[in-house]
């Protein structure tokens, strides 16, 4: 008789990434009998929750349930009903909530409490909502990309199954850019990590990894822009801020109260003789770059080498995957190609920022102006952060790979987080077993 396949024995997991600008829900799937194998977990769905990040619900906690409904209902549809009760759900909140907690622990707790109550109403196995540390965010991002790239697999292959694979076991570094923070994580070459706060030790699949990581709070692209505006308005002679990071002809009124709402601008706060000011774009990449560099304090370093603000950074080593907003921004600007040199990227950013606002609006007519207006700043910020902040050079630029997905799964911290919490990355290499025939009768 013909072999007939039994229903597949699979498991699912859900992770919600509650970022500063938005929340995304990810559904992962893997074969139950291969839990400890490397590279078997893959993403089957991403659902972007409509609206801002959860920290914005501080005055509207009663709406958090409605906010999460569509994506949680989507998870209900995607995951077979028979699997609902055993599907774990995790929510990790990142820098937006770290900032809210800095302002008010009570408000942050209230938001998380309502999130937990909302998620508990679903038929899944809810495992909790928490604010993850910057160190965790960096570490799990690093685990995610290396897991997906097959770097933890001990089997050497003569063929490449994933992009960017150099067919060796050297791990990729991880560069993550969010709205409120940015993380850099990699294995330095035989270098002691001089600051204990930045050191992580992992044993994964029988191999030890000494990993460097740091999360720069307030240096995500949105908070960096608020910082830059707060810094620049200090020296403005009146309520007009001629800003090189916005296109020529662009105009926008900003409330000073909005500028000082975030803890990230506290260091620049001063009493101004006006309640509002107008940004007037002048679109000059070089001047924008210079203005951004003033956000990085490089004047003091208590270690052999620093990134900025006195934070230790070992010499860069190997290839890096740059994801999240690093990818989204560069993708929008059409600058993700491996063939584009750093000089070319800079050249294209100069041209882009210099384009008149009216022209930009016509070229990208479908995009809301609120978001469209910030790509000149964001692109320039990415270059400044990578080159001056992290010390990439024109030569090492080619080691940066702007990555959205690997093998169909989004690059980001969520997969690594789930792999860790479900104990799916063993410390030791699993014993290899003969191929199972259990799925056939």
């Amino acid at each position: 008789t013909q072999n007939k396949a039994l229903p597949e024995n699979v498991k699912y997991g859900i992770v919600l990434d509650a970022g500063s600008s938005h929340t995304s829900l990810y559904i992962y799937k893997w074969p139950a009998e291969k839990e400890n194998d490397t590279g078997v977990v893959h993403q089957v769905e991403e659902c972007r929750v409509k609206g801002p990040g959860i920290s914005k619900f501080v005055q509207k906690v009663n709406e958090i349930g409605i906010y999460l409904t569509d994506c949680m209902e989507r998870a209900r549809e995607v995951i077979p009903r028979s699997q609902h009760q055993e599907t774990p759900v995790y929510l990790g909140a990142t820098a937006g909530m770290r900032l809210l907690r800095m302002e008010s622990e009570e408000l942050a707790d209230r938001v998380l409490d309502v999130v937990e109550r909302s998620l508990s109403n679903y038929p899944f196995d809810f495992q909790g909502a928490r604010i993850i540390t910057g160190q965790e965010e960096g570490a799990y991002g690093w685990i995610t990309i290396n897991y997906l790239l097959g770097k933890f697999s001990q089997k050497t292959r003569w063929f490449s199954i994933v992009p960017y694979e150099t067919n060796n076991q050297e791990t990729f570094g991880a560069l993550d850019l969010g709205g409120a923070s940015t993380q850099v994580t990699f294995v330095p070459q035989n270098q002691t990590i001089e600051s204990p706060d930045n050191a992580l030790q992992f044993r994964l699949y029988g191999k030890d990894y000494n990993v460097y990581t740091h999360s720069f709070l307030c240096y995500g692209k949105d908070q960096a822009l608020w910082q830059k505006l707060a810094k620049d308005i200090q020296v403005a002679s009146n309520e007009i801020l001629r800003d090189p990071c916005f296109h020529p002809g662009y105009k926008k009124v900003v409330n000073v109260s909005d500028l000082y709402k975030t803890p990230c601008t506290k260091r620049f706060e001063m009493t101004l003789p006006f309640q509002q000011f107008e940004i007037q774009g002048i679109g000059n990449y070089q001047q924008c770059h210079q203005s951004i560099l003033e956000l990085f304090n490089t004047s003091y370093c208590p270690y052999s080498q620093c990134a900025f603000n006195g934070i230790f950074l070992p010499p860069l080593q190997g290839d890096f995957g740059a994801f999240s907003a690093f990818y989204f921004v560069m993708k929008f600007l059409n600058l993700t190609s491996e063939k584009v040199s750093q000089e070319k990227v800079t050249e294209m950013m100069k041209k882009f920022c210099a384009q008149p606002w009216e022209e930009i609006k016509t070229s990208y007519a479908g995009v809301k102006e609120k978001y469209l207006s910030e790509y000149c700043f964001s692109g320039t910020y990415i270059l400044s952060l990578l080159l001056q902040g992290y010390h990439f050079t024109a030569d090492s630029w080619e080691h940066i790979h702007f990555i959205g997905k690997i093998q169909g799964s989004d690059a980001g911290w969520t997969l690594g987080y789930m792999l860790n919490l479900t104990n799916m990355i063993p410390a030791e290499q699993p014993l290899s077993t003969p191929l199972s025939h259990s799925t056939y009768v």
């Epitope: 938005h22 972007r48 609206g51 007519a365 479908g366 995009v367």
Partner: antibody, heavy 124, light 112 residues
């Protein structure tokens, strides 16, 4: 269900100001942009402006700059439009309308839910 | 500003037959991304407007498939097959390619 409730009528004196309200219910207020549209008696529709309730970001039709000010009160899920220095030209029905922009938050969308409209009559 | 032009009245239609309403824009609404930023709204007597069609060819949720739209970048036609009594009202075309968003003057659909 999703609703935008507006008061039925406002009678105001020439030269005065009026603040129109639009109370949202049945959805996450800060997750959708709110637009305001003017309709003069027997005439077409005129777009006034839009506001993102999550952070008060606004865009205005130049024809209404200085005339209309859009704000929100997140705690009560209410959008407001203040109209000042009113003249007979401002007599109209004013609608608030929610924007649906699909899965791509950064894209422009369409007005999928409209308020009941407030009739403003400017008369001494 | 982009000007949207409509004829004020359509020819009165008989129930169950087809109706066409036209709209013209002063600038092409077809963007290089392939999307046409043209919308249709219906305002029934005594009611608020409601969306029918977005981005020229997409039917809004709950709108019967008797409604369809075709057109080039500047000339558009809304077609209603098997017209029903509840279809009467003013039909507005609109664009959101550029700020300010603009509407046509509206076309009144009435029954014979």
């Amino acid at each position: 269900q999703v609703q935008l409730q507006q008061p039925g009528t406002e009678l105001v004196m020439p030269g005065a100001s009026v603040t129109l309200s639009c109370k949202a219910s049945g959805y996450s207020f800060i997750s959708y942009w709110m637009h305001w549209v003017k309709q003069r008696p027997g005439q077409g529709l005129e777009w006034i402006g839009e506001i993102d309730p999550s952070d008060d970001y606004t865009n205005y039709n130049q024809n209404f700059k200085g005339k209309a000010t859009l704000t929100v009160d997140r705690s009560s899920s209410t959008a407001y439009m203040q109209l000042n220095s009113l003249t007979s030209e401002d007599s109209a029905v004013y609608y608030c309308a929610r924007e649906e922009n699909g899965i791509y938050y950064y894209n422009k969308g369409y007005l999928d839910v409209w308020g009941t409209g407030t009739t403003v009559t400017v008369s001494s | 500003d982009i000007v949207m032009t409509q004829t004020a009245f359509s020819n009165p239609v008989t129930l169950g037959t087809s109706a066409s309403i036209s709209c013209r824009s002063s600038k092409s609404l077809l963007h290089s991304n392939g999307i046409t930023y043209l919308y249709w709204y219906l305002q029934k007597p005594g009611q608020s407007p409601q969306v029918l069609i977005y981005q020229m060819s997409n039917l809004a949720s709950g709108v019967p498939d008797r409604f369809s739209c075709s057109g080039s970048g500047t000339d558009f036609t809304l077609r209603i097959t098997r017209v029903e009594a509840e279809d009467v009202g003013f039909y507005y075309c609109a664009q959101n390619l550029e700020l300010p968003y603009t509407f046509g003057g509206g076309t009144k659909l009435e029954m014979k």
